[in-house]
């Protein structure tokens, strides 16, 4: 079941999933000057069964000939400054990611892909937060958020993370301390 909204925004932080639950959509977005091909998929889908999952559909971008002539669409300043969602950085692949049943790995990039990946997560998905460069993490608890179903509605738990403006970066779980790898957590505590 799809989560109704996006994971919470934390000032000066981005989030990332280490693996994607079956049913997750990744929108086929293209960088400026390119657009999804007319016969191309709207999104990729993490699909499969408990033993093997993979991304269905392929995203394809083509050079954009026709642009809007109206200039009403202008990026918001805060969106130009700082991306809140999953960025296309060099994706870290924890070694145990593939062994998670019912999950997909981070899909490989496609040609002329947009810089930001737009996911539609499903109930039970966990995402992990890190402070953007130039900010340091103050943890009051886990820097993660889980999409849960309560009373027929979906909601994301609030990550216990504050990013302060000090020149030091915090890492996603598993990037620095392998013993703290989140994938060891039982799935039951995130599923509804």
């Amino acid at each position: 079941e799809l989560c109704d909204d996006d994971p919470p925004e934390i000032p000066h932080a981005t989030f990332k999933a280490m693996a994607y639950k079956e049913g997750t959509m990744l929108n086929c977005e293209c960088k400026r000057g390119f657009r999804r091909i007319k016969s191309g998929s709207l999104y990729m889908l993490c699909t499969g069964n408990s033993s093997h999952s993979s991304w269905d559909n392929q995203c394809q971008c083509t050079s954009s000939a026709t642009r809007n002539t109206t200039k009403q669409v202008t990026p918001q300043p805060e969106e130009q400054k700082e991306r809140k969602t999953t960025e296309m950085q060099s994706p870290m692949q924890p070694v145990d990611q593939a062994s998670l049943p019912g999950h997909c790995r981070e899909p490989p990039p496609w040609e002329n892909e947009a810089t930001e990946r737009i996911y539609h997560f499903v109930v039970g998905q966990m995402v992990y937060y890190q402070c953007v460069q130039g900010y340091r993490a103050l943890h009051r608890g886990p820097a993660e958020s889980v999409c849960k179903m309560t009373h027929g509605k979906t909601r994301w738990t609030q990550p216990q993370l504050i990013c302060t403006g000090e020149m030091e970066t915090s890492q996603f779980p598993g990037e620095e301390k392998p013993q703290a790898s989140p994938e060891g957590r039982p799935e039951s505590e995130t599923s509804c």
């Epitope: 400026r32 016969s39 026709t66 809007n68």
Partner: antibody, heavy 114, light 107 residues
Framework: QVQLQQSGAELVRPGTSVKMSCKAA????????IGWIKQRPGHGLEWIGD????????NYNEKFKGKATLTADTFSSTAYMQLSSLTSEDSAIYYC???????WGQGTLVTVSS | DNVLTQSQKFMSTSVGDRVSVTCKAS??????VAWYQQKPGQSPKALIY???YRYSGVPDRFTGSGSGTDFTLTISNVQSEDLAEYFC?????????FGGGTKLEMK
């Protein structure tokens, strides 16, 4: 909570134009395509086109090229559709949709009558 | 354009029944199909995406299946609140198209 709030019903004269709005809330407006759908009794649902507010891109159903113009204003998180040279065939309910068709506005009823 | 055909315009059912609404595409769409429910005077409500995945809050008596050109929405243990019109849609290629709809009525 995701919401798409559409503007109210319109009664318009043949040959004129109408511009309706769709205000999005509860998600990042610039991340997702906004689609527009026409519904007429006996004609089912027809996809008019869509707009990506973050990328300034539009796609149109050939049938509605020249009839519909899609625009968006990211500051107010509002998408607009203008219909021109209206005829009785344009009398319908128009829906906007967001987040890959997961959410639909309540619809705007357009009645073209002299 | 890819034409979606819902051959049955009307279907009669009773509370507790199991009913299957079918949708046939004129061209292969993979699993890029959605199902919507529309009640009189209301907007369509998204039920299923990617042929078989339920949206949140959709009761599990609604199941979608199929791929390629043939798709089915099955409602098991029909409830009175399920009486509505059901539309399929393909979003595999532009222009996106909808089926003509199937109205579920009480016997």
């Amino acid at each position: 909570q995701v919401q798409l709030q559409q503007s109210g019903a319109e009664l318009v004269r043949p040959g004129t134009s109408v511009k309706m709005s769709c205000k999005a809330a509860g998600y990042t407006f610039t991340n997702y395509w906004i689609g527009w759908i026409k519904q007429r009794p006996g004609h089912g649902l027809e996809w008019i086109g869509d707009i990506h507010p973050g990328g300034d891109y539009t796609n149109y159903n050939e049938k509605f090229k020249g009839k519909a113009t899609l625009t968006a204003d990211t500051f107010s998180s509002t998408a607009y559709m203008q219909l021109s040279s209206l005829t009785s065939e344009d009398s319908a309910i128009y829906y906007c949709t967001g987040r890959n068709f997961a959410y639909w506005g309540q619809g705007t009823l357009v009645t073209v009558s002299s | 354009d890819n034409v979606l055909t819902q051959s049955q315009k009307f279907m009669s059912t009773s509370v507790g029944d199991r009913v299957s609404v079918t949708c046939k595409a004129s061209q292969n769409v993979g699993t890029n199909v959605a199902w919507y429910q529309q009640k009189p005077g209301q907007s369509p409500k998204a039920l299923i995406y990617s042929a078989s995945y339920r949206y949140s809050g959709v009761p599990d008596r609604f199941t979608g299946s199929g791929s390629g050109t043939d798709f089915t929405l099955t409602i098991s243990n029909v409830q009175s609140e399920d009486l509505a019109e059901y539309f399929c849609q393909q979003y595999n290629s532009y222009p996106y198209t909808f089926g003509g709809g199937t109205k579920l009525e009480m016997k």
